[in-house]
Protein backbone atom coordinates (compact mmCIF):
# COMPACT_ATOMS: atom_id res chain seq x y z
CA UNK A 1 0.00 0.00 0.00
CA UNK A 2 2.82 2.37 0.99
CA UNK A 3 4.63 1.55 -2.26
CA UNK A 4 1.53 2.34 -4.32
CA UNK A 5 1.07 5.61 -2.44
CA UNK A 6 4.71 6.56 -2.89
CA UNK A 7 4.59 5.71 -6.59
CA UNK A 8 1.30 7.54 -7.12
CA UNK A 9 2.48 10.59 -5.23
CA UNK A 10 5.78 10.56 -7.12
CA UNK A 11 3.84 10.48 -10.39
CA UNK A 12 1.55 13.38 -9.39
CA UNK A 13 4.44 15.50 -8.08
CA UNK A 14 6.43 14.86 -11.27
CA UNK A 15 3.38 15.65 -13.41
CA UNK A 16 2.98 19.02 -11.65
CA UNK A 17 6.72 19.62 -11.95
CA UNK A 18 6.83 18.91 -15.69
CA UNK A 19 3.76 21.08 -16.27
CA UNK A 20 5.64 23.81 -14.42
CA UNK A 21 8.78 23.30 -16.53
CA UNK A 22 6.68 23.59 -19.71
CA UNK A 23 4.98 26.71 -18.32
CA UNK A 24 8.31 28.29 -17.35
CA UNK A 25 9.81 27.54 -20.77
CA UNK A 26 6.87 29.21 -22.51
CA UNK A 27 6.67 32.22 -20.17
CA UNK A 28 7.85 35.65 -21.35
CA UNK A 29 9.01 36.82 -17.94
CA UNK A 30 12.43 35.22 -17.58
CA UNK A 31 13.95 38.63 -17.06
CA UNK A 32 12.06 41.78 -16.17
CA UNK A 33 13.13 45.40 -16.15
CA UNK A 34 14.53 46.43 -12.80
CA UNK A 35 12.52 49.38 -11.53
CA UNK A 36 14.45 49.89 -8.29
CA UNK A 37 16.67 52.99 -8.09
CA UNK A 38 15.88 53.84 -11.71
CA UNK A 39 14.09 56.76 -13.36
CA UNK A 40 10.55 55.47 -13.70
CA UNK A 41 9.93 54.78 -17.34
CA UNK A 42 6.48 54.64 -18.92
CA UNK A 43 7.59 51.46 -20.69
CA UNK A 44 8.18 48.11 -19.01
CA UNK A 45 10.48 45.61 -20.72
CA UNK A 46 10.56 41.88 -20.10
CA UNK A 47 12.12 38.96 -21.93
CA UNK A 48 11.62 35.25 -22.33
CA UNK A 49 13.52 32.44 -24.05
CA UNK A 50 11.62 32.92 -27.29
CA UNK A 51 10.63 36.59 -27.46
CA UNK A 52 10.99 39.97 -25.79
CA UNK A 53 8.05 42.15 -24.82
CA UNK A 54 7.35 45.78 -24.05
CA UNK A 55 4.34 46.91 -22.04
CA UNK A 56 3.50 50.59 -22.29
CA UNK A 57 1.65 52.74 -19.77
CA UNK A 58 -1.16 52.86 -22.30
CA UNK A 59 -1.67 49.16 -21.66
CA UNK A 60 -0.46 48.13 -25.11
CA UNK A 61 1.92 45.20 -25.11
CA UNK A 62 4.11 44.34 -28.05
CA UNK A 63 6.12 41.13 -28.24
CA UNK A 64 8.79 40.30 -30.79
CA UNK A 65 10.12 36.80 -31.38
CA UNK A 66 13.83 36.09 -31.71
CA UNK A 67 13.65 35.16 -35.37
CA UNK A 68 17.35 34.35 -35.61
CA UNK A 69 19.25 31.37 -34.28
CA UNK A 70 22.78 32.38 -35.12
CA UNK A 71 22.55 35.88 -33.65
CA UNK A 72 21.44 34.71 -30.19
CA UNK A 73 23.85 34.40 -27.24
CA UNK A 74 25.25 30.90 -26.75
CA UNK A 75 24.05 30.92 -23.13
CA UNK A 76 20.47 31.55 -24.22
CA UNK A 77 20.72 28.67 -26.69
CA UNK A 78 22.10 26.46 -23.91
CA UNK A 79 19.22 27.39 -21.59
CA UNK A 80 16.70 26.64 -24.33
CA UNK A 81 18.36 23.27 -24.94
CA UNK A 82 18.38 22.37 -21.24
CA UNK A 83 14.71 23.26 -20.84
CA UNK A 84 13.69 21.32 -23.96
CA UNK A 85 15.72 18.28 -22.88
CA UNK A 86 14.04 18.54 -19.48
CA UNK A 87 10.58 18.64 -21.05
CA UNK A 88 11.28 15.76 -23.45
CA UNK A 89 12.77 13.54 -20.72
CA UNK A 90 9.93 14.47 -18.38
CA UNK A 91 7.28 13.69 -20.99
CA UNK A 92 8.85 10.29 -21.76
CA UNK A 93 9.16 9.67 -18.03
CA UNK A 94 5.46 10.42 -17.56
CA UNK A 95 4.53 8.07 -20.37
CA UNK A 96 6.66 5.27 -18.91
CA UNK A 97 5.42 5.89 -15.36
CA UNK A 98 1.76 5.67 -16.39
CA UNK A 99 2.34 2.06 -17.46
CA UNK A 100 4.46 1.45 -14.36
CA UNK A 101 1.78 2.54 -11.89
CA UNK A 102 0.92 -0.35 -9.56
CA UNK A 103 -2.74 0.65 -9.48
CA UNK A 104 -3.03 0.24 -13.27
CA UNK A 105 -3.17 -3.27 -14.68
CA UNK A 106 -2.04 -3.70 -18.27
CA UNK A 107 -2.40 -7.22 -19.56
CA UNK A 108 -0.17 -9.70 -17.75
CA UNK A 109 2.64 -7.21 -17.01
CA UNK A 110 4.77 -8.44 -14.13
CA UNK A 111 5.55 -6.37 -11.06
CA UNK A 112 9.25 -6.76 -11.82
CA UNK A 113 8.66 -5.08 -15.18
CA UNK A 114 6.76 -2.35 -13.40
CA UNK A 115 9.63 -1.96 -10.96
CA UNK A 116 11.99 -1.52 -13.91
CA UNK A 117 9.74 1.04 -15.53
CA UNK A 118 9.27 2.88 -12.22
CA UNK A 119 13.04 3.12 -11.80
CA UNK A 120 13.47 4.26 -15.43
CA UNK A 121 10.82 6.97 -15.09
CA UNK A 122 12.27 8.01 -11.74
CA UNK A 123 15.72 8.49 -13.24
CA UNK A 124 14.17 10.39 -16.16
CA UNK A 125 12.33 12.69 -13.76
CA UNK A 126 15.51 13.32 -11.77
CA UNK A 127 17.47 14.21 -14.91
CA UNK A 128 14.54 16.30 -16.19
CA UNK A 129 14.40 18.24 -12.93
CA UNK A 130 18.14 18.76 -12.92
CA UNK A 131 18.02 20.02 -16.52
CA UNK A 132 15.35 22.57 -15.59
CA UNK A 133 17.17 23.71 -12.46
CA UNK A 134 20.43 23.96 -14.42
CA UNK A 135 18.76 25.91 -17.24
CA UNK A 136 17.12 28.38 -14.90
CA UNK A 137 20.32 28.76 -12.85
CA UNK A 138 22.44 29.43 -15.94
CA UNK A 139 19.98 32.14 -17.01
CA UNK A 140 19.90 33.61 -13.50
CA UNK A 141 23.71 33.71 -13.43
CA UNK A 142 23.70 35.46 -16.81
CA UNK A 143 21.26 38.05 -15.40
CA UNK A 144 23.32 38.67 -12.28
CA UNK A 145 26.47 39.19 -14.37
CA UNK A 146 24.70 41.59 -16.75
CA UNK A 147 23.01 43.40 -13.85
CA UNK A 148 26.29 44.29 -12.18
CA UNK A 149 27.89 45.18 -15.49
CA UNK A 150 25.08 47.61 -16.34
CA UNK A 151 25.15 48.97 -12.77
CA UNK A 152 28.86 49.71 -13.21
CA UNK A 153 28.08 51.43 -16.52
CA UNK A 154 25.44 53.55 -14.81
CA UNK A 155 27.96 55.06 -12.46
CA UNK A 156 31.00 55.21 -14.73
CA UNK A 157 29.37 56.15 -18.03
CA UNK A 158 28.15 59.59 -16.99
CA UNK A 159 30.92 61.40 -18.81
CA UNK A 160 28.72 62.55 -21.71
CA UNK A 161 26.30 65.44 -21.42
CA UNK A 162 23.28 63.38 -22.48
CA UNK A 163 21.91 60.91 -19.95
CA UNK A 164 20.59 57.56 -21.10
CA UNK A 165 18.24 55.31 -19.21
CA UNK A 166 20.21 52.17 -18.45
CA UNK A 167 17.75 49.29 -18.64
CA UNK A 168 18.77 46.68 -16.09
CA UNK A 169 17.07 43.31 -15.90
CA UNK A 170 16.29 41.28 -12.83
CA UNK A 171 14.78 37.85 -12.12
CA UNK A 172 11.40 37.29 -13.73
CA UNK A 173 8.56 35.07 -12.50
CA UNK A 174 9.56 32.28 -14.90
CA UNK A 175 12.81 31.70 -13.01
CA UNK A 176 10.97 31.00 -9.77
CA UNK A 177 8.42 28.82 -11.57
CA UNK A 178 11.32 26.94 -13.19
CA UNK A 179 13.20 26.40 -9.94
CA UNK A 180 10.11 25.16 -8.10
CA UNK A 181 9.01 22.99 -11.03
CA UNK A 182 12.49 21.51 -11.42
CA UNK A 183 12.58 20.77 -7.69
CA UNK A 184 9.17 19.10 -7.80
CA UNK A 185 10.18 16.95 -10.78
CA UNK A 186 13.36 15.97 -8.94
CA UNK A 187 11.42 15.07 -5.77
CA UNK A 188 8.90 13.11 -7.86
CA UNK A 189 11.75 11.21 -9.48
CA UNK A 190 13.30 10.34 -6.12
CA UNK A 191 9.89 9.11 -4.91
CA UNK A 192 9.56 6.91 -7.99
CA UNK A 193 13.01 5.42 -7.31
CA UNK A 194 12.05 4.75 -3.68
CA UNK A 195 8.81 3.13 -4.87
CA UNK A 196 10.83 0.95 -7.23
CA UNK A 197 12.91 -0.35 -4.32
CA UNK A 198 9.69 -1.34 -2.60
CA UNK A 199 8.25 -2.99 -5.71
CA UNK A 200 11.15 -5.34 -6.49
CA UNK A 201 11.18 -7.36 -3.22
CA UNK A 202 7.40 -7.80 -3.19
CA UNK A 203 7.76 -9.13 -6.71
CA UNK A 204 10.35 -11.73 -5.67
CA UNK A 205 8.45 -12.77 -2.58
CA UNK A 206 5.38 -13.35 -4.69
CA UNK A 207 7.37 -15.72 -6.85
CA UNK A 208 8.68 -17.61 -3.83
CA UNK A 209 5.12 -18.31 -2.67
CA UNK A 210 3.96 -19.31 -6.13
CA UNK A 211 6.89 -21.67 -6.53
CA UNK A 212 5.95 -23.37 -3.26
CA UNK A 213 2.37 -23.80 -4.36
CA UNK A 214 3.33 -25.37 -7.67
CA UNK A 215 5.32 -28.08 -5.94
CA UNK A 216 8.74 -27.14 -7.20
CA UNK A 217 11.78 -27.50 -4.98
CA UNK A 218 12.70 -23.99 -3.98
CA UNK A 219 16.22 -22.98 -3.04
CA UNK A 220 15.00 -19.74 -1.42
CA UNK A 221 14.84 -19.28 2.32
CA UNK A 222 11.18 -18.71 3.26
CA UNK A 223 12.25 -16.37 6.08
CA UNK A 224 12.68 -13.56 3.55
CA UNK A 225 8.92 -13.40 3.09
CA UNK A 226 8.40 -11.69 6.44
CA UNK A 227 10.28 -8.56 5.40
CA UNK A 228 8.47 -8.14 2.11
CA UNK A 229 6.60 -4.97 3.00
CA UNK A 230 9.53 -3.04 4.46
CA UNK A 231 11.52 -0.44 2.51
CA UNK A 232 14.63 -0.49 4.66
CA UNK A 233 16.03 -4.01 4.17
CA UNK A 234 15.32 -4.60 0.50
CA UNK A 235 18.91 -5.30 -0.49
CA UNK A 236 19.30 -7.72 2.41
CA UNK A 237 16.18 -9.52 1.24
CA UNK A 238 17.66 -10.04 -2.19
CA UNK A 239 20.74 -11.69 -0.66
CA UNK A 240 18.62 -13.93 1.55
CA UNK A 241 16.89 -15.35 -1.47
CA UNK A 242 19.86 -16.91 -3.19
CA UNK A 243 23.14 -15.45 -2.13
CA UNK A 244 23.82 -13.71 -5.47
CA UNK A 245 23.29 -10.10 -6.44
CA UNK A 246 20.87 -10.29 -9.33
CA UNK A 247 20.07 -7.54 -11.77
CA UNK A 248 16.44 -6.58 -12.45
CA UNK A 249 16.71 -8.30 -15.83
CA UNK A 250 17.73 -11.59 -14.26
CA UNK A 251 14.84 -11.48 -11.84
CA UNK A 252 12.51 -10.78 -14.68
CA UNK A 253 13.44 -14.01 -16.48
CA UNK A 254 12.44 -16.34 -13.65
CA UNK A 255 8.70 -16.57 -14.17
CA UNK A 256 9.09 -18.09 -17.61
CA UNK A 257 10.96 -21.04 -16.06
CA UNK A 258 8.63 -21.89 -13.22
CA UNK A 259 5.32 -20.07 -13.04
CA UNK A 260 3.44 -21.40 -15.99
CA UNK A 261 3.75 -25.18 -15.75
Amino acid sequence: MAVTACQGLGFVVSLIGIAGIIAATCMDQWSTQDLYNNPVTAVFNYQGLWRSCVRESSGFTECRGYFTLLGLPAMLQAVRALMIVGIVLGAIGLLVSIFALKCIRIGSMEDSAKANMTLTSGIMFIVSGLCAIAGVSVFANMLVTNFWMSTANMYTGMGGMVQTVQTRYTFGAALFVGWVAGGLTLIGGVMMCIACRGLAPEETNYKAVSYHASGHSVAYKPGGFKASTGFGSNTKNKKTYDGGAHTEDELQSYPSKHDYV
Epitope: A42, N45, S57, S58, V165
Partner: antibody
Protein backbone atom coordinates in the same frame (compact mmCIF):
# COMPACT_ATOMS: atom_id res chain seq x y z
CA UNK B 1 -16.86 57.23 -33.32
CA UNK B 2 -14.61 57.92 -30.31
CA UNK B 3 -15.63 61.04 -28.39
CA UNK B 4 -14.53 62.66 -25.13
CA UNK B 5 -17.13 65.13 -23.91
CA UNK B 6 -15.92 67.48 -21.17
CA UNK B 7 -18.02 69.51 -18.74
CA UNK B 8 -18.61 73.22 -19.24
CA UNK B 9 -16.54 76.25 -18.17
CA UNK B 10 -16.11 77.05 -14.49
CA UNK B 11 -15.73 80.38 -12.72
CA UNK B 12 -14.54 79.81 -9.17
CA UNK B 13 -13.25 81.74 -6.20
CA UNK B 14 -9.67 81.39 -4.88
CA UNK B 15 -9.30 78.63 -2.28
CA UNK B 16 -12.29 76.70 -3.61
CA UNK B 17 -12.27 73.38 -5.45
CA UNK B 18 -13.59 72.41 -8.86
CA UNK B 19 -14.49 68.98 -10.21
CA UNK B 20 -14.67 68.53 -13.95
CA UNK B 21 -15.79 65.50 -15.94
CA UNK B 22 -14.86 63.75 -19.16
CA UNK B 23 -17.46 61.37 -20.59
CA UNK B 24 -16.10 58.78 -23.01
CA UNK B 25 -18.10 57.16 -25.80
CA UNK B 26 -17.42 55.08 -28.90
CA UNK B 27 -14.98 52.68 -27.22
CA UNK B 28 -14.65 50.45 -24.16
CA UNK B 29 -13.85 52.90 -21.39
CA UNK B 30 -11.90 50.46 -19.21
CA UNK B 31 -9.56 49.47 -22.05
CA UNK B 32 -7.77 52.81 -22.24
CA UNK B 33 -5.90 55.01 -19.78
CA UNK B 34 -7.21 58.59 -19.44
CA UNK B 35 -4.77 61.52 -19.25
CA UNK B 36 -5.29 65.06 -18.08
CA UNK B 37 -3.36 68.01 -19.52
CA UNK B 38 -3.29 71.66 -18.45
CA UNK B 39 -2.86 74.63 -20.79
CA UNK B 40 -2.61 78.16 -19.45
CA UNK B 41 -3.86 80.94 -21.76
CA UNK B 42 -1.36 81.53 -24.57
CA UNK B 43 1.06 78.99 -23.12
CA UNK B 44 2.20 75.42 -23.66
CA UNK B 45 0.91 72.06 -22.48
CA UNK B 46 1.57 70.46 -19.11
CA UNK B 47 0.85 66.83 -18.22
CA UNK B 48 -1.04 66.43 -14.95
CA UNK B 49 -1.34 62.65 -14.74
CA UNK B 50 -3.48 59.71 -15.76
CA UNK B 51 -5.96 57.21 -14.42
CA UNK B 52 -6.50 53.64 -15.53
CA UNK B 53 -10.29 53.15 -15.33
CA UNK B 54 -9.85 49.36 -15.30
CA UNK B 55 -8.29 49.31 -11.83
CA UNK B 56 -8.40 53.01 -10.83
CA UNK B 57 -4.59 53.09 -10.77
CA UNK B 58 -3.20 56.61 -11.05
CA UNK B 59 0.10 58.26 -11.96
CA UNK B 60 0.69 61.93 -11.20
CA UNK B 61 3.17 64.57 -12.21
CA UNK B 62 4.85 65.43 -8.88
CA UNK B 63 3.95 69.09 -9.47
CA UNK B 64 0.24 68.23 -9.29
CA UNK B 65 0.28 65.80 -6.36
CA UNK B 66 -2.06 67.16 -3.72
CA UNK B 67 -3.46 69.67 -6.21
CA UNK B 68 -5.30 67.33 -8.61
CA UNK B 69 -7.23 64.16 -7.81
CA UNK B 70 -8.17 61.75 -10.58
CA UNK B 71 -11.11 59.37 -10.31
CA UNK B 72 -13.35 57.45 -12.68
CA UNK B 73 -16.78 55.88 -12.82
CA UNK B 74 -17.01 52.73 -14.94
CA UNK B 75 -20.80 52.64 -14.97
CA UNK B 76 -21.07 56.01 -16.69
CA UNK B 77 -17.74 55.76 -18.60
CA UNK B 78 -16.67 59.05 -17.08
CA UNK B 79 -13.32 60.27 -15.78
CA UNK B 80 -13.15 63.08 -13.23
CA UNK B 81 -10.52 65.53 -12.09
CA UNK B 82 -10.83 67.60 -8.97
CA UNK B 83 -8.51 70.57 -8.55
CA UNK B 84 -8.33 71.92 -5.00
CA UNK B 85 -7.11 75.09 -3.23
CA UNK B 86 -7.47 77.09 -6.41
CA UNK B 87 -5.30 80.12 -7.12
CA UNK B 88 -4.93 82.33 -10.19
CA UNK B 89 -2.15 79.95 -11.30
CA UNK B 90 -4.82 77.28 -11.80
CA UNK B 91 -6.70 79.36 -14.35
CA UNK B 92 -6.33 77.30 -17.52
CA UNK B 93 -7.99 74.99 -20.02
CA UNK B 94 -7.93 71.38 -18.82
CA UNK B 95 -8.04 68.61 -21.39
CA UNK B 96 -8.73 64.92 -20.98
CA UNK B 97 -7.05 62.67 -23.56
CA UNK B 98 -7.05 58.95 -24.20
CA UNK B 99 -3.68 57.19 -24.03
CA UNK B 100 -2.96 55.09 -27.08
CA UNK B 101 -0.22 52.92 -28.54
CA UNK B 102 3.24 54.43 -28.13
CA UNK B 103 1.91 56.28 -25.04
CA UNK B 104 0.50 58.88 -27.43
CA UNK B 105 -2.73 60.76 -26.76
CA UNK B 106 -4.90 60.05 -29.77
CA UNK B 107 -8.30 61.52 -28.80
CA UNK B 108 -8.78 64.72 -26.84
CA UNK B 109 -11.77 66.34 -25.18
CA UNK B 110 -12.70 69.87 -26.19
CA UNK B 111 -11.33 71.19 -22.89
CA UNK B 112 -12.81 72.67 -19.72
CA UNK B 113 -11.97 76.30 -19.06
CA UNK B 114 -11.41 77.14 -15.39
CA UNK B 115 -11.16 80.77 -14.33
CA UNK B 116 -10.14 81.56 -10.76
CA UNK B 117 -11.28 85.02 -9.79
CA UNK B 118 -12.53 86.73 -6.66
CA UNK C 1 12.29 65.98 -15.31
CA UNK C 2 13.19 65.63 -18.97
CA UNK C 3 13.51 68.97 -20.71
CA UNK C 4 12.19 69.15 -24.26
CA UNK C 5 13.72 71.96 -26.31
CA UNK C 6 11.96 72.95 -29.52
CA UNK C 7 13.44 75.21 -32.17
CA UNK C 8 12.68 77.59 -33.65
CA UNK C 9 9.98 79.01 -31.38
CA UNK C 10 8.23 80.43 -34.43
CA UNK C 11 8.66 80.05 -38.16
CA UNK C 12 7.28 82.11 -41.03
CA UNK C 13 6.69 80.04 -44.15
CA UNK C 14 5.12 80.16 -47.58
CA UNK C 15 2.67 77.63 -48.98
CA UNK C 16 4.31 74.55 -50.58
CA UNK C 17 7.56 75.23 -48.76
CA UNK C 18 9.44 72.39 -47.04
CA UNK C 19 9.68 72.90 -43.28
CA UNK C 20 11.79 71.17 -40.64
CA UNK C 21 10.96 71.52 -36.93
CA UNK C 22 13.49 70.42 -34.33
CA UNK C 23 13.02 68.87 -30.89
CA UNK C 24 15.80 67.88 -28.50
CA UNK C 25 15.41 65.99 -25.23
CA UNK C 26 17.73 66.16 -22.22
CA UNK C 27 17.68 62.37 -21.98
CA UNK C 28 17.50 59.59 -24.53
CA UNK C 29 13.95 58.52 -25.38
CA UNK C 30 15.08 55.28 -27.00
CA UNK C 31 13.79 52.15 -25.33
CA UNK C 32 16.28 49.31 -25.70
CA UNK C 33 13.55 46.66 -25.34
CA UNK C 34 11.93 47.39 -28.70
CA UNK C 35 14.34 49.94 -30.18
CA UNK C 36 11.59 52.53 -30.35
CA UNK C 37 11.79 56.21 -29.47
CA UNK C 38 9.00 57.35 -27.22
CA UNK C 39 8.49 60.79 -28.70
CA UNK C 40 5.18 62.16 -29.93
CA UNK C 41 4.30 65.15 -32.14
CA UNK C 42 1.03 67.12 -31.87
CA UNK C 43 -0.53 69.91 -33.90
CA UNK C 44 -2.70 72.51 -32.16
CA UNK C 45 -4.78 75.09 -33.95
CA UNK C 46 -6.20 78.14 -32.09
CA UNK C 47 -9.22 77.32 -29.91
CA UNK C 48 -8.84 73.57 -30.54
CA UNK C 49 -7.38 70.68 -28.55
CA UNK C 50 -4.07 69.22 -29.78
CA UNK C 51 -4.19 66.60 -32.54
CA UNK C 52 -1.89 63.57 -32.67
CA UNK C 53 0.38 63.52 -35.72
CA UNK C 54 3.28 61.17 -35.01
CA UNK C 55 4.05 58.60 -32.32
CA UNK C 56 7.15 56.41 -31.74
CA UNK C 57 9.05 59.36 -33.28
CA UNK C 58 8.29 58.26 -36.84
CA UNK C 59 4.94 56.42 -37.00
CA UNK C 60 2.24 58.53 -38.64
CA UNK C 61 -1.18 58.41 -37.01
CA UNK C 62 -3.95 57.19 -39.33
CA UNK C 63 -5.61 60.00 -41.21
CA UNK C 64 -2.56 62.26 -41.01
CA UNK C 65 -1.39 63.44 -44.47
CA UNK C 66 1.84 61.85 -45.67
CA UNK C 67 3.50 65.25 -46.02
CA UNK C 68 4.14 64.99 -42.27
CA UNK C 69 7.21 62.89 -41.49
CA UNK C 70 8.85 62.25 -38.13
CA UNK C 71 12.47 61.19 -37.78
CA UNK C 72 15.36 61.05 -35.32
CA UNK C 73 16.52 58.85 -32.49
CA UNK C 74 17.82 59.13 -28.94
CA UNK C 75 17.74 62.83 -28.15
CA UNK C 76 17.42 64.59 -31.52
CA UNK C 77 14.15 64.56 -33.41
CA UNK C 78 12.63 66.37 -36.35
CA UNK C 79 9.18 66.86 -37.83
CA UNK C 80 9.26 67.57 -41.55
CA UNK C 81 6.37 69.01 -43.54
CA UNK C 82 7.32 68.36 -47.15
CA UNK C 83 4.95 70.91 -48.68
CA UNK C 84 3.23 73.26 -46.25
CA UNK C 85 -0.49 73.88 -46.81
CA UNK C 86 -2.53 76.78 -45.40
CA UNK C 87 -4.30 74.39 -43.01
CA UNK C 88 -0.94 73.39 -41.48
CA UNK C 89 -0.54 76.77 -39.81
CA UNK C 90 -0.61 75.91 -36.12
CA UNK C 91 1.59 75.30 -33.07
CA UNK C 92 3.53 72.02 -33.09
CA UNK C 93 4.48 70.33 -29.83
CA UNK C 94 6.81 67.41 -29.20
CA UNK C 95 6.31 65.30 -26.09
CA UNK C 96 8.42 62.87 -24.08
CA UNK C 97 6.29 59.82 -23.32
CA UNK C 98 9.16 57.64 -22.09
CA UNK C 99 10.06 58.88 -18.63
CA UNK C 100 7.66 60.27 -16.04
CA UNK C 101 6.50 62.94 -15.89
CA UNK C 102 5.54 63.20 -19.56
CA UNK C 103 6.87 66.58 -20.67
CA UNK C 104 6.04 68.80 -23.64
CA UNK C 105 8.26 71.13 -25.58
CA UNK C 106 7.37 74.85 -25.58
CA UNK C 107 6.08 74.49 -29.14
CA UNK C 108 6.95 75.87 -32.58
CA UNK C 109 4.47 78.29 -34.09
CA UNK C 110 4.08 78.04 -37.85
CA UNK C 111 2.95 81.32 -39.43
CA UNK C 112 2.20 82.34 -42.98
CA UNK C 113 4.46 84.88 -44.67
Amino acid sequence: EVQLQQSGPELVKPGASVKMSCKASGYTFTNYVMNWVKQKPGQGLEWIGYINPYNDGTKYNERFKGKATLTSDKSSSTAFMEVSSLTSEDSAVYYCARLYRGNAMDYWGQGTSVTVSS
Amino acid sequence: DIVMTQSPSSLTVTVREKVTLSCKSSQSLLNSGNQKNYLTWYQQKPGQPPKLLIYWASTRESGVPDRFTGSGSGTDFTLTISSVQAEDLAVYYCQNVYIYPFTFGAGTKLELK
